[in-house]
């Protein structure tokens, strides 16, 4: 059985389209499961992995490896 584009698995009922945009940064494995690109995490791979040591409470990042501080906090790790 050959599945349609972006469909995987037994019965071709698993859908996965690789994407690299605001809504996700991932490839699809042979079973149609998302595999996040380096630097991204979460079920949709749309959450950037911040700089190692970045304060989870006072820092955040839009892009991997970044660490943006909340107002009132500073430093490399916003701590």
């Amino acid at each position: 059985v050959t599945c349609d584009d972006y469909y995987y698995g037994f019965g071709c009922n698993k859908f996965c389209r690789p994407r690299d945009d605001f809504f996700g940064h991932y490839a699809c494995d042979q079973n149609g499961n998302k595999t996040c690109m380096e630097g991204w995490m979460g079920p949709e791979c749309n959450r950037a992995i911040c700089r190692q040591g970045c304060s989870p409470k006072h820092g955040s990042c839009k892009l991997p490896g970044d660490c943006r501080c909340q107002y009132g906090w500073q430093g490399l790790y916003c701590d």
Partner: antibody, heavy 119, light 107 residues
């Protein structure tokens, strides 16, 4: 279970701004972007934009660029949509909505917030 | 931006009828299409995603088909609770636009 609870109805003057809130529960807030969709009375649905609460990244419908601002507060799992320079055509029900799992589109919706713009 | 053209805009039918609503995208959306049902005063409810997959707890009388730019929602045997407005929506690339809607009324 996933729940999205929005703030109450608003009556606004033309030229002013409105800020609608959407409190999320039942899932990890930072795992999914929050989208905003509006519906004018008797009209269809219009996607306004989305925010990734984890890092604050945003995507906007160009139609609203410059007038709409999406923000999120991770500490309270609340997303906000602020629309400025209001005009009568902005009278609509505003919905926050979230994708489901495994690439669903909008599986979860808030109850909607009616914003009326009138002088 | 990809535009979605939905037809018909309104439709009268009877309980038990088979009904088809179509949606055409201005570009290839690769099955990234959803169908919603909306009743007055309520938020839309997801029926079908990825063109043909039924959302949770949606009755099997609803089905979706299509590929490329042309997609169809079919209700095999209308029930009284199916009279509502139906919207298609693509989610291939931002902005994620909706069709204009199809109001399904009782004949």
């Amino acid at each position: 279970q996933v729940q999205l609870v929005q703030s109450g109805a608003e009556l606004k003057k033309p030229g002013s701004s409105v800020k609608v809130s959407c409190k999320a529960s039942g899932y990890t807030f930072t795992d999914y972007e929050m989208h905003w969709v509006r519906q004018a009375p008797g009209q269809g649905l219009e996607w306004m934009g989305a925010i990734q609460p984890g890092g604050g990244g945003t995507a906007y419908n160009q139609k609203f660029k410059g007038r709409v601002t999406l923000t999120a507060d991770k500490s309270t799992s609340t997303a906000y949509m602020e629309l400025s320079s209001l005009r009568s055509e902005d009278t609509a029900v505003y919905y926050c909505t979230r994708r489901g799992y495994d690439d669903y589109p909008f599986a979860y919706w808030g109850q909607g917030t009616l914003v009326t713009v009138s002088s | 931006d990809i535009q979605m053209t939905q037809s018909p805009s309104s439709l009268s039918a009877s309980v038990g009828d088979r009904v088809t609503i179509t949606c055409r995208a201005s570009g290839n959306i690769h099955n990234y299409l959803a169908w919603y049902q909306q009743k007055p005063g309520k938020a839309p409810k997801l029926l079908i995603y990825n063109a043909k997959t039924l959302a949770d707890a949606v009755p099997s009388r609803f089905s979706g088909s299509g590929s490329g730019t042309d997609y169809t929602l079919t209700i095999s045997s209308l029930q009284p609770e199916d009279f509502a407005t139906y919207y298609c929506q693509h989610f291939w690339s931002a902005p994620w636009t909706f069709g204009g809607g199809t109001k399904l009324e009782i004949k």
